[in-house]
Interface confidence: low
């Protein structure tokens, strides 16, 4: 059987190293050897690359080596396959060396910011030594932030051959580490070099961005002073790695700047003790390069009437988010402040807040909140410097069954009735909204009965019991996830009512 006709001939010119062609099939059923016929010097010369020795036999690749590698040039390549039964020739293929040249990768030797030019890194590299001097090289620069797996790319060409090359990569994030790698190819070639070794550079730091500023107004103290907890954070969109050295706060009663007080802190929260009047508070952050724009907050007077414009609010869960939506009667209000914190019996340990603009909804990823915890969510309307009345709701991102059932007791035991009372489960043990309570009760050796009541009921009178009978009873508290029973209690109905007995005695 004749060998298969060599197909899919592919050639590549490794600059100043070799000219290599490959083809298929890579393996023949019987022993096959190959000749690769080449014409070069624009057709004036020809030669053969042979794979017929035992080490290269049946191997679908052959390389032409210097000094007969001419460049620039056009080659023709034809592959002959031969076995014991005869010869099969490929079609003649044509190769322009400029189009199939592959060179070494460049070498980055400097990645640095340029003083005074923001959000830019200057990359310097050395052109590969083995690259044709006259040719324009095209480059791909890949870059990513150090913590990202996602590469971005920029393409450009360079004609300058006399010195280390330079490229200015702009529109980066401030004060951020970037990883760089570079590859190149002659402009006409279809083959890129490998990627250079990765190098890291950091963009210049900038003066801080603005701050978002908020407050929690606490009840006035006995001496009339009002504690106000100030909080601030980087404005939305500020670079993650921007570094603040500290914060300056100054505040004064409205219309009385003579009474300005100043505070310097490195924290992102500070408690002020204010009088009953309206106050203005200002905060800036600073670093070695300057200050942020001023964040301003008006603290209303103690007796100031606040406007109300949120009419309703709903919290709903999607697959991976908690979404809070609200309806407002004031179309001119387009900024809202959302507060959320765990509803715990003690002082909340984590208090969060976020500004919302041009929307009447707020979303948070479920994994940012703890499952089985109840969160208080409040939305404040903000109209210029005025903060309106908040509207509040509660939400769980995931409910579970309560960790404990209700503590129950039996009161007012009668002949055929009993009043059962139970305590609310502590917040920390509810694990969801208590939607109802179910009272399970059973006479000794008798059938079990149950009665379900709403979650706002903590007492229930059971009737139609049997006189002088022992009962066991427990109350189950249920969330959407299921119920948990409280401790079992036992009681015995009376044989004769106290009231009746008392009456008899009088006669």
């Amino acid at each position: 059987v004749l060998p298969a006709k060599p197909e899919n001939i592919s050639c590549i010119f490794y600059y100043e190293e070799n000219f290599t062609c490959t083809w298929s099939p890579e393996k023949e059923a019987s022993y096959t050897w190959y000749k690769v016929k080449r014409t070069y010097s624009y057709g004036y010369k020809s030669d053969i690359c042979s794979t017929d020795n035992s080490t290269r036999g049946n191997h679908a690749s052959c390389s032409f080596l210097p000094p007969t590698i001419t460049n620039p040039d056009n080659y023709t390549i034809q592959v002959e396959a031969q076995n014991a039964d005869g010869i099969m020739k490929s079609d003649i293929t044509y190769w322009n060396l400029d189009a199939i040249m592959k060179i070494e990768p460049p070498e980055i030797f400097s990645v640095k910011s340029v003083l005074g030019i923001k959000r830019m890194l200057q990359i310097k590299w050395i052109r590969p030594v083995l690259a044709p001097h006259s040719s324009t090289l095209k480059y791909t620069l890949r870059f990513r932030t150090i913590n990202s797996a996602y590469w971005m790319e920029v393409n450009f060409t360079k004609e300058d051959i006399d010195r280390d090359e330079t490229y200015n990569l702009t529109e980066l994030q401030a004060f951020t580490e970037y990883v760089m790698t570079l590859r190149c190819a002659p402009a006409e070639s279809m083959f890129w070099s490998g990627w250079s070794q990765e190098k890291v550079g950091t963009t210049e730091e900038e003066a801080p961005y603005g701050l978002d500023l908020w407050r929690v107004l606490k009840p006035a103290m006995v001496d009339g002073r009002r504690p106000v907890q100030l909080m601030w954070k980087k404005a939305t969109g500020a670079p993650v790695l921007e570094k603040a050295l500290g914060y300056n706060i100054w505040y004064f009663p409205e219309n009385n700047t003579n009474l300005t007080e100043t505070v310097n802190t490195t924290n992102q929260t500070h408690e002020l003790y204010l009088g009953g009047k309206t106050y203005w508070v200002y905060v800036v952050s600073y670093n070695s390069l300057g200050e942020s724009p001023v964040a301003t907050l008006r603290i209303p007077a103690l007796n100031e009437k606040t406007f109300q414009c949120i009419e309703a609010m709903q919290a709903c869960l999607t697959q991976d988010q908690l979404v809070v939506e609200w309806q407002s009667s004031a179309p001119e209000v387009d900024t809202w402040m959302v507060e959320w914190f765990p509803d715990v019996d003690s002082e909340p340990s984590s208090f969060s807040w976020e500004s919302v603009s041009q929307a009447r909804n707020w979303t948070i990823q479920k994994d940012e909140l703890k499952p089985l915890w109840c969160y208080n969510i409040s939305v404040y309307p903000v109209l210029r410097d005025r903060v309106g009345q908040p509207y509040s709701t509660q939400a769980y991102v995931q409910e579970g069954i309560p960790s404990a059932g209700p503590v129950t007791q039996a009161d007012s035991i009668g002949v055929k009735t009993v009043t059962i009372t139970w305590k609310e489960i502590p917040k920390s043990k509810r694990n969801g909204f208590i939607k109802n309570y179910t009272i399970f009760y059973q006479a000794e050796d008798g059938k079990e009965f149950s009665k379900t009541v709403n979650s706002n009921i903590l007492q229930y009178r059971l009737e139609s019991l049997t006189r002088r009978t022992s009962y066991s009873l427990q109350v189950m508290a249920s969330t959407n996830a299921g119920g948990t029973n409280g401790t079992k209690i036992n009681f015995k109905t009376l044989s004769i009512s106290h009231h009746h007995h008392h009456h008899h005695h009088h006669h």
Epitope: E107, F109, V111, K112, L115, D164, Q197, K199, G201, T202
Partner: antibody
Framework: EVQLVQSGAEVVKPGASVKVSCTAS????????IHWVRQRPGAGLDWIGR????????KYAPKFQGRATLTADTSTNTAYMQLSSLRAGDIAVYYC????????????WGTGTLVTVSS | DIVMTQTPLSLSVSPGETASISCKAS??????VTWFRQKPGQSPQLLIY???NRYTGVPDRFSGSGSGTDFTLRISTVEADDTGVYYC?????????FGQGTKLEIK
């Protein structure tokens, strides 16, 4: 402490070669370039070349190309400079220096090695 | 190769005065210029990088300026300890080159 400690002074015959070592402590040479600079007696500073120890890539000043060979052994955190075909004009103190590509300056210099060429 | 030409080659200044050393590049090197000081018998020490940035621990009496082809190192309120040879160096383009050095002497 970040430092570069070089090998001791050498006396070599004309035409011979010399190999100077530069051992780093307090940092990994793979994360920097190591440059070599020479200073002839009473004269200025002359750049010889540099190596990227992470991959062995080198770059030489044209006047040292072919005579200087820069190598590095990352397992011992040491860089080497070999200069061949020595002549009287090569009598000098040879320095290695760290060049960190992020900041792009020579911030740490070696202790210096005096090479004397004498028959 | 880029040639870095320093002037003057030697300078004698009284304590408390200001010393200025100039460095001219034969072609633009943007701001890729570094200044070193070398004291007798010691290795060079980094003073200024990227033309105008003071290296950590260098007193603010030392300042660098310039871009393109003309650069200056200024030492204000010179002290006795400032004696030594001062070199400029460009790392804009290979081969990297140094100025001839300026010897500063304190009177």
């Amino acid at each position: 402490e970040v430092q570069l400690v070089q090998s001791g002074a050498e006396v070599v015959k004309p035409g011979a070669s010399v190999k100077v070592s530069c051992t780093a402590s307090g940092f990994n040479i793979k994360n920097t370039f190591i440059h070599w600079v020479r200073q002839r007696p009473g004269a200025g500073l002359d750049w010889i070349g540099r190596i990227d120890p992470a991959n062995g890539n080198t770059k030489y000043a044209p006047k040292f190309q072919g005579r200087a060979t820069l190598t590095a052994d990352t397992s011992t955190n040491t860089a080497y400079m070999q200069l061949s075909s020595l002549r009287a004009g090569d009598i000098a103190v040879y320095y290695c220096a760290r060049y960190y590509y992020v900041s792009s300056y020579f911030d740490v210099w070696g202790t210096g090695t005096l090479v004397t060429v004498s028959s | 190769d880029i040639v870095m030409t320093q002037t003057p080659l030697s300078l004698s200044v009284s304590p408390g005065e200001t010393a200025s050393i100039s460095c001219k590049a034969s072609q633009s090197v943007t701001n890729d210029v570094t200044w070193f000081r070398q004291k007798p018998g010691q290795s060079p020490q980094l003073l200024i990088y990227s033309a105008s940035n003071r290296y950590t621990g260098v007193p603010d009496r030392f300042s660098g300026s310039g871009s393109g082809t003309d650069f200056t190192l200024r030492i204000s309120t010179v002290e006795a300890d400032d004696t030594g040879v001062y070199y400029c160096q460009q790392d804009y383009s290979s081969p990297w080159t140094f100025g001839q050095g300026t010897k500063l002497e304190i009177k």
